[in-house]
């Protein structure tokens, strides 16, 4: 069973001091939400017993193995069902605690009832505050049964449940009609899946005979031991104030386990700690009684004395539960109550015995669960004991169960049963996950679900290039960490597989399924530099750059230009997807902005070194567009343009710029400056005859303004081919200014 204990502190004078603690003795318990250890969960279960809403309860984790619930503000907060969930995978287990109000109308004589399949369960609700109304019994919150108030027997209402079956398990309550549900008596009925002393799928297997009030688990045949007892059959008492499957936990506080209720995995349920009894576990056992809830009687013989925590303490020369065995009778010594081996291993098991006459090698034998008897291969004889060593044949799963070491001499015999757990080495069910990749390394998460048994002690990652026949490379990692595979080849597919191991000899599992992980491209190493740039408008910038000349092919897919606007804290990125490109036009920029500009080569997703940055100031946005632009052909080589000044000018115009382009032509347009801003007409000369031209213009103050509308006009025919257009304003002729 899972080593999980739910502790309830029942010192109820002040609900604010009440707390519930869930303690796990499991390896890796509560470590987090990964595959190796789901967290401990501790919560109030409001599905059956609903209490008025109050402030939320506080959950505090004390390390990975303990979680505590506090923050109860009033007694009604305590009433109901609490559960703790722990353990991983198929071993995930829920432990349940049912809390009754001490001031309820009805109180349970006993809260937890563990019964065998087919038994009759009797739930007894004691009248604490009488009401002359019927008593309603509910099962898991649903109406179940009615008793008239006249039916109380000795101040108790009894619910008899004959021939119970596992589905009858659950939370039962007895409530006076019309009374608050918080005044109910709440019970927990646990019905084992088998009849008394049996376990297993068809209830065909015999329980080990749990001692000291331990309960045989109907699924795995293990004894769930009461708090304060340990061993395969709960044969060993812990020291006072200790609990847990290996007595590894200590009760908090100076008064030990007084006032604590212990709840353990089903089918045990809840009880006081060893040596204590009563509804609040505050009463010490009466003389002659011991154990959880003081349910056990000592009946010590041969001068043994009764200890309320451990039972009979035997005088020298005697041993046994009741000090009934003489030390002359042979005795198995210090046999571990539980051993764990991995599947298909051939372990050695030792069994030591003492007695008078002294046991010899042939007098000690080992019996497997299927009845096979193994004889020891050698024995070590020491003055106080003989230790027989058994070589066990290759283990199979069917060897899991209770083995028995038996010693027989003329003085008598002794046997000790112990549990052997044959564990299946873990095998990953999925491939590892790729987290990040670079050109020469892969970062991999090996955490995958697995079949077989944990805990995971080591994780091996095997990898080699895809389609390679070379040996696998192996790296051993911590189970909870991601792995970096280094010194790989760029742009190469690798087959990667996980192998998990559990503790012990033969704990290595088979390799998991492979997955293909590909390293990234090599990083581009060349650093470009910015050749130059020029402003083509208030929001346009043409940039050119170069690369160093190196032998061999260029490693790169293109360029990334970055413009940083420090004032606004904004970055603009422009992707140039050709590695041959050496120029780019950046548009849509913000006029009047100071930019930092750089360029870098990229390859796949990797960026090379950035060029040294350049600082570029875009001119502020210019004036509005000139209005009513009009073109009029004057000859076969001249066209006159007229316009009106822009409206709402922010300042004096420094010049106009005219753009001239042959209609339908593929060449770049020509820009001509009109340096006399007061003019409203100009003549463009040197044009070709019978040719259709497009014109538009804009004004400049500090920066170039918006373009005007475009106008079309054709020169007159039959002229000679001109050398190219020039401009003449009304006042004077100007030379061509491109």
């Amino acid at each position: 069973a899972v080593d999980l204990t739910l502790l309830a502190n029942l010192r109820l004078t002040d609900p604010q001091r009440f707390f519930l603690t869930c303690v796990s003795g499991e390896a890796g318990a509560g470590r987090g939400s990964d595959a190796w250890g789901p967290p401990l969960l501790l919560e109030k279960d409001d599905r059956i017993v609903r209490t008025p809403p109050g402030p939320p309860l506080r959950l505090a984790r004390n390390g990975s193995h303990q979680v505590t619930l506090r923050g109860f503000s009033k007694p009604s907060d305590l009433v109901g069902v609490f559960s703790c969930v722990g353990g991983a995978g198929a071993r995930r287990t829920r432990v349940i605690y049912v809390h009754n109000s001490p001031g309820a109308h009805l109180l349970p004589d006993k809260v937890t009832h563990t019964v065998n399949k087919g038994d009759t369960a009797v739930l007894s609700a004691r009248v604490h505050k009488e009401k002359q109304t019927d008593v309603i019994w509910k099962s898991n919150g649903s109406y179940f049964y009615t008793l008239d108030w006249h039916e109380a027997q000795d101040g108790r209402f009894l619910l008899q449940l004959p021939n119970v079956q596992p589905p009858s398990s659950g939370i039962y309550s007895a409530t006076y009609l019309e009374a608050s549900p918080l005044g109910s008596a709440f019970f927990r009925l646990i019905v084992r899946g088998c009849g008394a002393g049996r376990w297993g799928p068809g209830c065909t297997k015999e329980c080990p005979g749990c001692l000291h009030g331990g309960v045989c688990h109907d699924h795995d045949g293990e004894c769930v031991c009461p708090p304060g007892f340990t061993g395969t059959r709960c044969e060993q008492a812990c020291r006072e104030g200790r609990f847990g499957q290996s007595c590894q936990e200590q009760c908090p506080g100076i008064s030990g386990c007084r006032g604590l209720t212990f709840c353990l995995p089903d089918p045990y349920g809840c009880s006081c700690g060893s040596g204590w009894r009563g509804s609040q576990c505050q009463e010490a056992c009466a003389p002659g009684h011991f154990g959880a809830d003081c349910r056990l009687q000592c009946q010590c013989q041969n001068g043994g004395t009764c200890d309320r925590f451990s039972g009979c303490v035997c005088p020298s020369g005697w041993h046994g539960v009741h000090c009934e065995k003489s030390d002359r009778i042979p005795q198995i010594l210090n046999m571990a109550s539980e051993l764990e081996f991995n599947l298909e291993t051939m372990p050695r098991i030792n069994c030591a015995a003492a007695g008078n006459p002294f046991p010899v090698r042939g007098s000690i034998e080992l019996r497997k669960p299927d009845g096979t008897v193994l004889l020891s291969t050698k024995a070590i004889v020491e003055p106080e004991k003989t230790t027989a060593e058994f070589e066990v044949p290759r283990l199979v799963l069917a060897d899991s169960g209770f083995w028995e070491c038996r010693v027989s001499t003329s003085g008598g015999q002794d046997s000790r049963r112990f549990k052997v757990n044959v564990k299946v080495p873990p095998v990953p069910l999925a491939a590892p996950r790729l987290l990040t990749k670079q050109s020469r390394q892969l970062v991999v998460s090996p955490l995958v679900s697995f079949s077989g048994d944990g805990p995971i002690s080591t994780v091996r990652l095997h990898y080699r290039p895809q389609d390679s026949t070379m040996d696998w490379s192996t790296i051993v990692v911590d189970p909870s960490e991601n792995v970096t595979l280094m010194n790989l080849r760029p742009k190469t597919g690798y087959s990667v597989r996980v192998q998990l191991s559990r503790p012990g000899e033969g704990g290595e599992g088979a390799w998991g399924p492979p997955t293909l992980m590909t390293t990234d491209c090599p990083e581009p190493l060349l650093q470009p530099w910015l050749e130059g740039w020029h402003v083509e408008g208030t929001d346009r910038l043409r940039v050119s750059w170069s690369l160093p000349l190196v032998p061999g092919p260029l490693v790169g897919d293109g360029f990334l230009l970055r413009l940083w606007d420090g004032t606004r804290g904004q970055e603009r990125r422009e992707n140039v997807s050709s590695p041959q490109a050496r120029t780019a036009l950046l548009t849509g920029l913000t006029p009047g902005t100071h930019y930092q500009l750089d360029v870098q080569l990229y390859h796949c997703t990797l960026l090379g070194p950035a060029s040294p940055p350049a600082h570029v100031l875009l001119p502020p946005s210019g004036p509005p567009a000139p209005r009513h632009l009009h073109a009029q052909a004057l000859s076969d080589s001249e066209i006159q343009l007229t316009w009106k000044h822009p409206e709402a000018l922010p300042g004096p115009i420094s010049k106009y710029v005219v753009e001239v382009q042959v209609a339908g032509g593929a060449g770049d347009p020509l820009w001509i400056d009109v340096d006399r801003p007061e003019e409203t007409s100009t003549i463009i000369r040197g044009l070709n005859a019978s040719t259709r031209y497009l014109f538009r213009m804009r004004a400049s103050i500090q920066g170039l303004g918006d373009w005007s509308n475009t106008v079309e006009e054709s020169t007159l025919g039959n002229g000679l081919q001109a050398e190219g257009p020039v401009q003449e304003s009304r006042a004077a002729e100007e030379g061509l200014d491109q």
């Epitope: 008793l147 006249h150 009609l177």
Partner: antibody
């Protein structure tokens, strides 16, 4: 679906006896209080007797000592043994199932007529 | 014994009208223990209301119950043709379990 089916009614002479049965189905019979209610011709309803899951029984004063209610949980059947019958016992006898918590009779059989006459 | 008195004895109404039936107990009855039943000629009674105001399964919401102590009321907000029947109240608080004498709701 809950069903209650009464049987055993008929004509009987004063002083005679009859045993009524009520076969129940569609619910967990052993968990519920069961009742007998009667209705004399043209009159209102009169509660007769009840039996709790535990076997505890209750009777109206008018039938106490003459009628016995019982149940057989293994057969899901309710009984009413009527002895020393009188003319005023003439009625349709209904068996009824309790809603739970003895709050009301939520299902009724169709009734069986008992006539006591010489 | 607790006497349950219903009024009126007969209520003559038309379909669509509102019906208000009264039930008075000779001593205080817990509201958890007051139920109303409907009975049509030749049929077994049918549970309408329990706990004074809770509708039984399948009962239309035009039926409602109210009251506490000694005075309880059954209201049918809008009479349908199938609602014309005899209605009984019943107390479950004391032995014996007693019914009212019934109120007949007939078509006017």
């Amino acid at each position: 679906e809950v069903q209650l089916l009464e049987s055993g009614g008929g004509l009987v002479q004063p002083g005679g006896s009859l045993r009524l049965s009520c076969a129940a189905s569609g619910f967990t019979f052993s968990h519920y209080v069961m009742w007998w209610v009667r209705q004399a011709p043209g009159k209102g309803l009169e509660w007769v007797s009840g039996i709790y899951p535990s076997g505890w029984t209750v009777y109206a004063d008018s039938v106490k000592g003459r009628f016995t209610i019982s149940r057989d949980n293994s057969k899901n059947t309710l009984y009413l043994q009527m002895n020393s019958l009188r003319a005023e016992d003439t009625a349709v006898y209904y068996c009824a199932k309790d809603l739970g918590g003895t709050r009301a009779f939520d299902y009724w059989g169709q009734g069986t007529l008992v006539t006591v006459s010489s | 014994d607790i006497q349950m008195t219903q009024s009126p004895g007969t209520l003559s109404l038309s379909p669509g009208e509102r019906a208000t039936l009264s039930c008075r107990a000779s001593q205080s009855v817990s509201s958890s223990y007051l139920a109303w039943y409907q009975q049509k000629p030749g049929q077994a009674p049918r549970l309408l209301i329990y706990g004074a105001s809770s509708r039984a399964t399948g009962i239309p919401d035009r039926f409602s119950g109210s009251g506490s102590g000694t005075d309880f009321t059954l209201t049918i907000s809008r009479l349908e043709p199938e609602d014309f029947a005899v209605y009984y109240c019943q107390q479950r608080g004391n032995w014996p379990r007693t019914f009212g004498q019934g109120t007949k709701v007939e078509i006017k």
